[in-house]
């Protein structure tokens, strides 16, 4: 299953399959997730080691047993690949690293005014994988405000150096934020020229394209079909690049198919997995296991559940079958692709779905209405769980926020439904940033059921929590995916990086905002919070957040929205915006419903009809 925990001061011994330099453990974990054989990783931050060559070292590891011995190493961070972790699987990495220079091939230099602009330039440049920016205080005046766009053979820095007044980061193309746009066309009977960066075997051009999309240096590809004249080249997928970023020439060629990486697509990227099953095809590879199962779909499920399995063949040969069950061959290879593809067989083959974002139907659950004061604009895909709850009576208006916690579930505040309990009047918009983008043609979700906490009473601050079951399940994308829930009774975790988001008022007597606002707010202990509210009881089922001096807070219209905290690289829904004394007032923290205290209730209410929980807490 999905293992998200990180091990501090621990290093996995042995099992190395690859190594690289990464700026932090989270990026190392992402590289492990997308590496075909990596199950475990260990990362050495700069502070953990004197050897300059090993600083920022990211070591990707495999193990037949799924685990490796851990040795104590001060400062090291180790963990698991996020294969099988559904919506947590993403190649998108937004962080900016201050005081760090990520080295690579510098192919473009320009002057820009901010690191954000530099990241934008990288994202809008087809060859840029990462960048470094020299700030206005950089020691050499001639380099100040320089934005260096970079690439490397593996897509990761060739070295990482600690350097003051330099900021580095990665292209946001994997976040589906590129302005370049992409070519969706597949060109039949056409071969592209230029440099081959890799060669794999695939059953069709679509798998070839997805592999190209997630390969760090592939910009376009040519696929040779299974009837290509040279037998040894059949089903070969050639991943290609060029200096210009486009093919320098193309040749008409029977039984070839060419196309482009979809990494530069805006708003939608293909899933990093291949779900199609290929009848009459055998995939060859290293044998992992053989098991008897009933049907090819069960074979695929078995492969997906066995984390090391990359692809499978389900044999229908009489000698491979007993009663209704036949042999399911679970296989793997060095590069994640079959080592041989045979046609006209009595088998059916396909790939593990361990890297599919959608996962199953489960979710990672690892007094005045309130909005965002003192916040800043959010960007696309930054808070993909944020939804807008709107009411359509004569006019349509945004009333509350909410958090997507499953394909069919939204968590919000009970008080949002005070006086409006009718599900038909509500419209739920997900995957949006600007309210002004909503037109009559914008898709929305309707409510199947509103579940208000049984102990909630109108106009009281207690048990201010409600679940919304949507009429139809939502697909997950980079812009629309769930937030992890905390573990039940999560009291030991000290959260230091917490954010509140919403379209609510930007001042006490204000108006709904167009662009989703975000604000970084520190948590306040319940004891401190209680002192600030002389007449309201701050219970253990509440969590408070705010600045002593005020100025930043949630406000009217943010109610029901998320208070999320990042811990060990993972966002968790810590609170639901509930109430406060005015907005952003001095010494008056915002009060949020503490989600961890309601985990039993959430899990009970989200049980599906077959009794299978649709939410899971991380182990």
């Amino acid at each position: 299953g999905c293992l998200t925990q990180l091990y501090e001061n621990a290093f996995f011994r042995g099992g190395d399959v690859a190594s690289m330099y990464t700026p932090n453990a989270q990026y190392c974990q992402m590289r492990c997730t997308f590496h075909p054989r990596c199950l475990l990783f260990s990362f050495l931050p700069a502070s953990s080691i004197n050897d300059m060559e090993k600083r920022f070292g990211c070591f990707l590891k495999d193990s037949v047993t799924g685990t490796l011995p851990k040795v104590h190493r001060t400062g090291a961070v180790s963990g698991h690949s996020l294969k099988q972790c559904g919506h947590q699987i993403s190649a998108c990495h937004r962080d900016i690293y201050k005081g760090v220079d990520m080295r690579g091939v510098n192919f473009n230099v320009s002057k820009v005014s901010s690191v954000e602009e530099c990241q934008k330039r990288c994202t809008s440049n087809i060859r840029c994988q990462f960048f470094s920016y020299a700030t206005q205080t950089f020691h050499k005046a001639e380099y100040r405000n320089n934005c260096l766009l970079k690439y490397s053979p593996g897509g990761t820095p060739t070295a990482i150096k600690v350097l003051s007044n330099v900021e580095s980061g990665f292209s946001l193309k994997p976040c589906a934020l590129s302005e370049i746009g992409c070519h969706m066309n597949i060109f039949q009977h056409l071969a592209f020229s230029d440099v081959d960066v890799a060669r794999v075997l695939t059953p069709d051009a679509f798998v070839c394209r997805t592999i190209c999309t997630y390969h760090p240096n592939c910009l376009f590809f040519t696929f040779y079909t299974n009837v290509w004249k040279i037998e040894s080249q059949r089903n070969v997928c050639l991943l290609k690049t060029s200096e210009s970023g486009t093919p320098s020439s193309s040749t008409p060629q029977e039984n070839t198919i060419s196309g482009y990486s979809l990494l530069t697509c805006k708003r939608t990227l293909p899933e990093p997995c291949h779900s199609k099953i290929y009848p009459g095809v055998d995939f060859g590879g290293e044998e992992l296991n053989v098991t008897f199962v009933k049907g090819v779909n069960v074979c695929q499920e078995t492969c997906t559940k066995m984390i090391r399995c990359q692809f499978f063949t389900y044999s229908l040969l009489p000698e491979d079958c007993k009663e209704e069950k036949c042999k399911c061959f679970l296989r793997l290879s060095m590069d994640g692709s079959p080592t041989r593809i045979a046609y006209g067989t009595q088998g059916s083959s396909g790939y593990s779905l361990r890297l599919c974002n959608t996962g199953d139907n489960s979710v990672c659950t690892t007094k005045t209405s309130t909005r965002i004061v003192g916040g800043t604009n959010s960007s696309w895909g930054e808070w993909p769980w944020q939804v807008s709850l709107q009411v359509k009576l004569t006019a349509q208006r945004h009333l509350c926020g909410g958090s997507l916690i499953g394909h069919q579930w939204v968590l919000t505040a009970a008080h949002c439904f005070d006086g409006l309990p009718l599900q038909d009047v509500w419209r739920i918009y997900s995957g949006i940033l600007n309210l002004s983008d909503i037109t009559k043609d914008t898709p929305f979700s309707q409510i199947k059921e509103i579940i208000i906490h049984q102990n909630y009473k109108v106009s009281e601050g207690n048990h201010d929590i409600a679940l919304i079951k949507l009429q139809a399940p939502l697909n997950y994308t980079e812009f629309q995916k769930p937030i992890c829930l905390p573990s039940k009774g999560d009291t030991s975790t000290i959260y230091t990086n917490c954010w509140v988001t919403g379209w609510g008022f930007s001042k006490e007597k204000g108006e709904i905002q167009n662009i989703l606002q975000k604000v970084n707010i520190p948590l306040v202990t319940n004891e401190e919070c209680q002192k600030r509210y002389q007449d309201y009881k701050i219970t253990q089922r509440m969590v408070c957040a705010g600045y002593k001096e005020g100025g930043k807070d949630a406000c009217k219209g943010d109610s029901g929205g998320p208070l999320v905290c990042k811990h060990n690289g993972m966002w968790r829904l810590v609170g639901i915006t509930s109430w406060g004394e005015g907005c952003a007032r001095r010494e008056q923290p915002g009060v949020y419903t503490k989600v961890a205290e309601y985990m039993d209730w959430i899990l009970e209410k989200t049980q599906s009809s077959d009794g299978k929980a649709q939410m899971q807490s991380p182990a």
Epitope: E460, Q530, K531, R532, Y533, Q534, D535
Partner: antibody, heavy 116, light 106 residues
Framework: EVQLHQSGAELVKPGASVRLSCTAS????????IFWVKQRPEQGLEWIGR????????KFDPKIQGKATLTADTSSNTAYLQLGSLTSEDSAIYYC?????????WGQGTLVSVSA | DIQMTQSPSSLSASLGGKVTITCKAS??????IAWYQHKPGSGPRLLIH???TLQSDIPSRFSGSGSGRDYSFSISNLEPEDIATYYC????????FGGGTKLEIK
């Protein structure tokens, strides 16, 4: 309207115990804290303790510990203060109050006289 | 535990005048001080919390200030109904009242 109604005056003998009641109206005691405060004749106010009626959690002034017991009955929306082993030092007006971080609303007080 | 020293213990002032009461805490109480008005036969009434925040129904003639260990409370434009005993209360660490100040009108 928020109101706290306290039981009537009590005349008790030294060594005995007494139970004072504080009945709330206009709000649910589960949604607040109930505090108790003592005022001896011609003297100032002293905090005794507080109860969270939702879970019966209590907090006391360390000097009072053992003398007072706080309870609550959410079905009747009433909080109680029980005082044991009474001496003349316990002769006072006892107030109940509701609130969160502070005593925001007060009852009218109950006079307890300890006399042989 | 925190002690609160309130002074004066009594004072007399003229109608329309101004009075100031002070409270000194034995430790820094981080502005967590409240002021109450107490008249015989009823429970005390909360006037100010968090040093200077007036309760919603309290006239602006009442004010509070201070920080650290030293706090003060003032009533300006004195009216007959202001005759009462006034208490400070620290609520930074549990609760401690000051000794009280009895206000009389000359």
């Amino acid at each position: 309207e928020v109101q706290l109604h306290q039981s009537g005056a009590e005349l008790v003998k030294p060594g005995a115990s007494v139970r004072l009641s504080c009945t709330a109206s206009g709000f649910n005691i589960k949604d607040t804290y109930i505090f108790w405060v003592k005022q001896r004749p011609e003297q100032g106010l002293e905090w005794i303790g507080r109860i969270d009626p939702e879970n019966d959690n209590t907090k006391f002034d360390p000097k009072i510990q053992g003398k007072a017991t706080l309870t609550a009955d959410t079905s009747s929306n009433t909080a109680y203060l029980q005082l044991g082993s009474l001496t003349s030092e316990d002769s006072a007006i006892y107030y109940c109050a509701k609130g969160g971080g502070l005593f925001a609303y007060w009852g009218q007080g109950t006079l307890v006289s300890v006399s042989a | 535990d925190i002690q609160m020293t309130q002074s004066p213990s009594s004072l007399s002032a003229s109608l329309g005048g101004k009075v100031t009461i002070t409270c000194k805490a034995s430790h820094d109480i981080n502005k967590y001080i409240a002021w109450y008005q107490h008249k015989p036969g009823s429970g005390p009434r909360l006037l100010i919390h968090f040093t200077s925040t007036l309760q919603s129904d309290i006239p602006s003639r009442f004010s509070g200030s201070g920080s650290g260990r030293d706090y003060s409370f003032s009533i300006s434009n004195l009216e007959p109904e202001d005759i009462a005993t006034y208490y400070c209360l620290q609520y930074d660490n549990l609760f401690t009242f000051g000794g009280g100040t009895k206000l009389e009108i000359k």
